[in-house]
Amino acid sequence: MAVTACQGLGFVVSLIGIAGIIAATCMDQWSTQDLYNNPVTAVFNYQGLWRSCVRESSGFTECRGYFTLLGLPAMLQAVRALMIVGIVLGAIGLLVSIFALKCIRIGSMEDSAKANMTLTSGIMFIVSGLCAIAGVSVFANMLVTNFWMSTANMYTGMGGMVQTVQTRYTFGAALFVGWVAGGLTLIGGVMMCIACRGLAPEETNYKAVSYHASGHSVAYKPGGFKASTGFGSNTKNKKIYDGGARTEDEVQSYPSKHDYV
């Protein structure tokens, strides 16, 4: 029962995590204009992995996609790649884990096969979570570096009377969503790996055999041997769970900004 709960919880946590990674990847607020210690501007800038947006105080928002591939910073491309790899691995992990769930019966699938699939999906979730955390952290590091660089020369053209205010960017909501989502996926993966250990067949129970010695009424019953193979096939004692299959179809996609509102 504990194994089923651990596996189910691991699946749900990973599902929420991957939904969060997808949301973070699609979000436009990876970096937002730093408002602290800045003149009050009637324009608010924020940027995502795929496009940059400008929200005017008038209420109108304009978003522009990064239509170039070669002109983008290598770090941004790396972050995109990490997030996509995280999503792909997570999606495959989810698919595998659905079939690995103890509460779902598919044909005559062995417990050992389910254990293998649980471990596989667990590892996939761990890698997916790490990819997301790495992607978000790389972007955050890039922001910190740029922030201090732009702070160093906050005002350019100080020679004359004219000043140019440089827009500084700070952490956007997507970074926090990404960190939390990556962490959840990682935790879910660890839970799946723990569940895998419990799923592995532990006992091979042989039926007691009676040997009738002539003249004596002594029954010899050999004790059950502990199976140490871990993932060996256990065809004798299959347990059938008929718990309802839970489908989670509430994967949220982040509402996209409008090009012109």
């Epitope: 204009q33 003149p39 009050v40 501007t41 009637a42 324009v43 800038n45 940027q47 940059s52 947006c53 400008v54 005017e56 105080s57 008038s58 209420g59 109108f60 304009e62 522009r64 004219v162 000043q163 140019t164 205010v165 440089q166 827009t167």
Partner: antibody, heavy 118, light 113 residues
Framework: DVQLVESGGGLVQPGGSRKLSCAAS????????MHWVRQAPEKGLEWVAY????????YYADTVKGRFTISRDNPKNTLFLQMTSLRSEDTAIYFC???????????WGQGTLVTVSA | DIVMTQSPSSLTVTTGEKVTMSCKSS????????????LTWYQQKPGQSPKLLIY???TRESGVPDRFTGSGSGTDFTLTISSVQTEDLAVYFC?????????FGAGTKLELK
Amino acid sequence: DVQLVESGGGLVQPGGSRKLSCAASGFTVSSFGMHWVRQAPEKGLEWVAYISSGSSPIYYADTVKGRFTISRDNPKNTLFLQMTSLRSEDTAIYFCARFYYGNSFDHWGQGTLVTVSA
Amino acid sequence: DIVMTQSPSSLTVTTGEKVTMSCKSSQSLLNSGNQKNYLTWYQQKPGQSPKLLIYWASTRESGVPDRFTGSGSGTDFTLTISSVQTEDLAVYFCQNNYFFPLTFGAGTKLELK
């Protein structure tokens, strides 16, 4: 058709109060940022106050901060400017204007004259 | 506060003439996020409320004749009327739409010779 009509102007004594109204038609004031702009006789334009579509933030010109209050009544589709502690330098035609693309003011009212004099 | 300086303060013209007026801001009005300049031009005829002509420094408002052209970037902006008509005689104001308070220039008065 978008229309803005100001009212509430008139002669006020220094230190007195006045509430200006701006009735909007053709659009809902709650969906747009709105402004009050004034123009002293034979002078240039001076921005006075701004209220965003969500009623926050609200900004005021330093010359009126603490004395003027911008607000709106969404059901009545009306913008207000409550003016207190009026001074002679507040004498002007007060316009309400709608915020638009590029943070520009695309529609203006005809204006209402406020005269602060003893 | 951002100071908007318009020049000249008045212009005496004849119909059909090309007119250019300048507006300078004390800080750049260029937003790096969308590479747009938050400067607006308005026209105000005597006894009337101002009318929007150009926003984003160069985008003409719908219904505005194409003889009106806005140009410039950063801190220096220009409004050009390619061929002045009698109905263009008015005061032209530029406005900073990037920083609060949203300051206006003193205006350029267009008069007939």
